[in-house]
Interface confidence: low
């Protein structure tokens, strides 16, 4: 009598996640009578995948009709494959008994699952930074298999080189994750800039996945302040202008102080955007010179995006003011300068 053979012709099968996997198994003889069972893994911890005799295996169907007495094909099809299904599958013949007795196992078929990486998610720094500072962006993608993967960073289409990438776990796994951190030096022109994390994998058929982050979420462009006084009007009123330029984001509060006392507070809103994504804002203050006995110290105080206030101060001399003034006069563009206006 010829010895029973359990034949698993494929040593390995590779399937894309979501597809069905066919695991082939034939036996050389139907004698002795007894069921075929499929297991994942070997040894005492093996997992029952399909039992012809009994049980409920919704994702596993026999390729051939197992109820036919002359059927020698015990191949199975596993539907909707996920990375968790990876492993070595064994087709095992049992002799009918109480309990059934294992007779022979096939050599095993290793099922590897090609799983697409998830869409890369790019996250930026928790707090904004100003130009010339370096900020870190992190890109994460999960659930892919096999482990080989390529990740690139771009800023406005230009490839970046300052980044570190890790693929986890280091050992064998059903699926893998990638995490990469790129360091980007900010410039004042980066409000409209974008960083892109690009992931290439065998499952993507040459069409890489991309995740993006806008540098507008990471950058703060502090304003320039310029204070100017227009010519004195015939009614002894001086028009003082505070120009706040090239700032981002728009969140800005401007306060006028006269001799240290708050005169007016304004919040920036609905400002037109400059081409580079920054904003400008101009505020005016009319000072009635004849109403003041002493010199008036005017301060334009700007608080931008929750940062410490920046002040521009100057003094209007009221002791002997002529009716007409010459050209405009500007306060110096530094933190708390004072300028005397005669």
């Amino acid at each position: 009598e010829e010895e029973l053979q359990v034949i698993q012709p494929e040593k390995s099968v590779s399937v894309a996640a979501g597809d069905s996997a066919t695991l082939n198994c034939t036996v050389s003889s139907l004698i002795p009578v007894g069921p075929i069972q499929w297991f994942r893994g070997a040894g005492p911890g093996r997992e029952l995948i399909y039992n012809l005799k009994e049980g409920h295996f919704p994702r596993v169907t026999p390729v051939s009709d197992p109820t036919k007495r002359n059927n020698m094909d015990f191949s199975i099809r596993i539907s909707n494959i996920t990375p968790a299904d990876a492993g070595t599958y064994y087709c095992v013949k049992f002799r009918k008994g109480s309990p059934d007795v294992e007779l022979k196992s096939g050599a095993g078929t290793e099922l590897s699952v090609r799983a697409k990486p998830s869409a890369p998610v790019v996250s930026g720094p928790a707090v904004r930074a100003t130009a010339e500072h370096t900020v870190s962006f992190t890109c994460e993608s999960h659930g892919f298999s096999p482990r080989d993967i390529t990740l690139k960073w771009f800023k406005n289409g230009n490839e970046l080189s300052d980044f570190q990438t890790n693929v986890d776990p280091a050992g064998k796994s059903v699926s893998y994750s990638i995490r990469s951190t790129a360091r980007v030096v900010l410039t004042r022109r980066d409000v409209h800039s974008q960083v892109i994390c690009e992931v290439a994998h065998v499952t993507l058929q040459g069409d890489p996945l991309r995740g993006t982050a806008n540098l507008s979420e990471a950058i703060r462009v502090p304003p320039f302040l310029e204070v100017t006084q227009q010519s004195m009007r015939a009614d002894n009123q001086v028009n003082v202008t505070c120009q706040v330029t090239k700032f981002y984001p728009q969140r800005l509060q401007l306060t006028w102080l006269e001799n240290g006392n708050v005169s007016r507070t304004e919040m920036a809103s609905a400002l037109p955007e400059n081409k580079d994504g920054t904003y400008n804002w101009t505020s005016w203050l009319l000072v009635n010179v004849s109403a003041h006995r002493d010199d008036v110290k005017l301060t334009c105080q700007v608080e931008h995006d929750g940062q410490p206030a920046v002040n521009k101060s100057f003094s209007v001399k009221v002791s002997a003011h002529p009716k007409e003034q010459g050209s405009n006069t500007a306060a110096e563009n530094t933190g708390t300068n004072e300028r005397n206006i005669y």
Epitope: D19, S20, T22, E54, G55, H56, F57, P58, R59, T61, P62, V63, S64, D65, P66, T67, R77, S79, N80
Partner: antibody, heavy 118, light 107 residues
Framework: EVQLVESGGGLVQPGGSLRLSCAAS????????MHWVRQATGKGLEWVSA???????YYTGSVKGRFTISRENAKNSLYLQMNSLRAADTAVYYC????????????WGQGTMVTVSS | DIQMTQSPSSLSASVGDRVTITCRAS??????LAWFQQKPGKAPKSLIY???SLHSGVPSKFSGSGSGTDFTLTISSLQPEDFATYYC?????????FGQGTKLEIK
């Protein structure tokens, strides 16, 4: 839209042949188990044949050796070659898609009528 | 082959009624049982798979239950469009087999 459209039915004499076609749209036919089901006028449904994703084929006993199921992936089409036709084969033939999870039928075509008569 | 037996063969009911159709398999089919609805001159429509799961777009008034050899289809509140013929089918092994059908008629 996922759709199955059968064609090729008609009147044929006993012993004759006919080839039914099923054009699939909205999905890749080769990724699913595909079936032919028939229904004689005023009667119930009868499963006829199936083709699996691996090309494995199955038939009901009464058509074995006479009918051949096949598919053409390039045309996203399923076929049923019917030879040695008998009067008992007269029926509406439906093309049916088996579901991803467990081959449960989910999409049916509108059917094509086959009449075997002399 | 696995034989599928439906009962009753026909059933009269009124709009708003709750009706139950049973299907028995000649051997254990786990839960590989489907239910279909067919109206005259139309292709069957898939209602339920794996004994109790509704196909997408099928209203929740349809429900299925059972495992092994005995299964039921319940329609909770009949509407005029529900009067049709219903078939059960086993798909645990080839050849797939259908029940003979239950014709649901308006009373």
């Amino acid at each position: 839209e996922v759709q199955l459209v059968e064609s090729g039915g008609g009147l044929v004499q006993p012993g004759g042949s006919l080839r039914l076609s099923c054009a699939a749209s909205g999905f890749t036919l080769s990724s699913y188990d595909m079936h032919w089901v028939r229904q004689a006028t005023g009667k119930g449904l009868e499963w006829v044949s199936a083709i699996g994703t691996a090309g494995d084929t199955y038939y009901t006993g009464s058509v074995k050796g006479r009918f051949t199921i096949s598919r053409e992936n390039a045309k996203n089409s399923l076929y049923l070659q019917m030879n040695s036709l008998r009067a008992a084969d007269t029926a509406v033939y439906y093309c049916v898609r088996g579901g991803v999870w467990d081959d449960a039928f989910d999409i049916w075509g509108q059917g094509t009528m086959v009449t075997v008569s002399s | 082959d696995i034989q599928m037996t439906q009962s009753p063969s026909s059933l009269s009911a009124s709009v708003g009624d709750r009706v139950t159709i049973t299907c028995r398999a000649s051997q254990d089919i786990n839960n590989y049982l489907a239910w279909f609805q067919q109206k005259p001159g139309k292709a069957p429509k898939s209602l339920i798979y794996t004994a109790s799961s509704l196909h997408s777009g099928v209203p929740s008034k349809f429900s299925g239950s059972g495992s092994g050899t005995d299964f039921t289809l319940t329609i909770s509140s009949l509407q005029p469009e529900d009067f049709a013929t219903y078939y059960c089918q086993q798909y645990v092994s080839y050849p797939y087999t259908f029940g003979q059908g239950t014709k649901l008629e308006i009373k």
